[in-house]
């Protein structure tokens, strides 16, 4: 819980952060490096065929608190990790897919023809 009077808005970094980007490189990235006022991230998720896909890149300060919180999404296996401690810190992030729930075997993409 936030203390009274404490801002819920994330604090702006005094300087730009460079991150590795893969499958998630914006137009202003160069040599698979993007820049941000927020966080670097690495994410793993299943595509439509159930294959794990890893993406990485930059998250802007706006909304990044929510995006980095890794809130579970029904019927979607996904995990995200964020960092800010140094440039390209997301090279060292290795999120893993959450374990399959029993329900996922029934409802999951495996059974879609």
């Amino acid at each position: 819980k936030k203390e009274d009077g404490e801002s819920t808005a994330p604090t702006a970094r005094p300087k730009v952060l460079r991150c590795k980007c893969h499958h998630h490189c914006p137009e202003d990235s160069v040599n698979n490096i993007c820049s941000t006022d927020g966080y670097c991230f690495t994410m793993i998720e299943e595509d439509d065929s159930g294959t794990p896909v890893v993406t990485s890149g930059c998250l802007g300060l706006e909304g990044s608190d929510f995006q980095c919180r890794d809130t579970p999404i029904p019927h979607q296996r996904r995990s995200i990790e964020c960092c800010t401690e140094r440039n390209e810190c997301n090279k060292d992030l290795h999120p893993t897919l959450p374990p399959l729930k029993d329900r996922d075997f029934v409802d999951g993409p495996i059974h879609h023809k």
């Epitope: 005094p14 300087k15 730009v16 460079r18 914006p26 137009e27 202003d28 990235s29 160069v30 490096i33 993007c34 820049s35 941000t36 006022d37 927020g38 930059c58 802007g60 300060l61 706006e62 140094r86 440039n87 390209e88």
Partner: antibody, heavy 116, light 112 residues
Framework: QVQLLQPGAELVKPGSSVKVSCKAS????????MQWVKQRPGQGLEWIGE????????LYNQKFKGKATLTVDTSSSTAYMQLSSLTSEDSAVYYC?????????WGQGTTLTVSS | DVVMTQTPLSLPVSLGDQASISCRSS???????????FHWYLQKPGQSPELLIY???NRFSGVPDRFRGSGSGTDFTLKISRVEAEDLGVYFC?????????FGSGTKLEIK
Amino acid sequence: QVQLLQPGAELVKPGSSVKVSCKASGYTFTNYWMQWVKQRPGQGLEWIGEIDPSDTYTLYNQKFKGKATLTVDTSSSTAYMQLSSLTSEDSAVYYCARFGYYVDYWGQGTTLTVSS
Amino acid sequence: DVVMTQTPLSLPVSLGDQASISCRSSQSLVHSTGNTYFHWYLQKPGQSPELLIYKVSNRFSGVPDRFRGSGSGTDFTLKISRVEAEDLGVYFCSQSTHVPFTFGSGTKLEIK
């Protein structure tokens, strides 16, 4: 107040190398990037590259890769730019500049003269 | 590389006049974070550049309010409402959205 102190001038011979210094004060050195910019008379300003003193991460303008090497000494809050294989084309004023998301403070510049 | 085209190259003015300098970039300067990293600097004779305006329209500390920056995307303008003697020098536009960062070729503000 923020200050970036550079030597006023360097005179060097063609083919040699030079290491230009930039001593920062008035702020936390590791909280900002340090950039280096070249200015030749009538040629405008050219971005050489930048270094993050907190982790020594560097980014270079492709044009200056192999020419410039950026380093820092955090214990003395000093940034360095080494220029190698000097020619008359490297004669210019070189500025260090503090960078967060834009350059807000510049050093006074070091005039490099390459001459035999 | 992003090319920054500044006009005019030379701007003769009388003290007290309004001055206007334009800068156009070869591609949009809107960063993926939504910020536009476009800035204006003034280099007075024999000195290093100094920051006037950052992120299109924000005056840096100590910069008089006669300096106004505006624009978006690829087209930007610096207006000086009443030119004073201390405003003379070369004005540079700059972008830090795309690596390598680039500068305009400069506009020399001089007395008519």
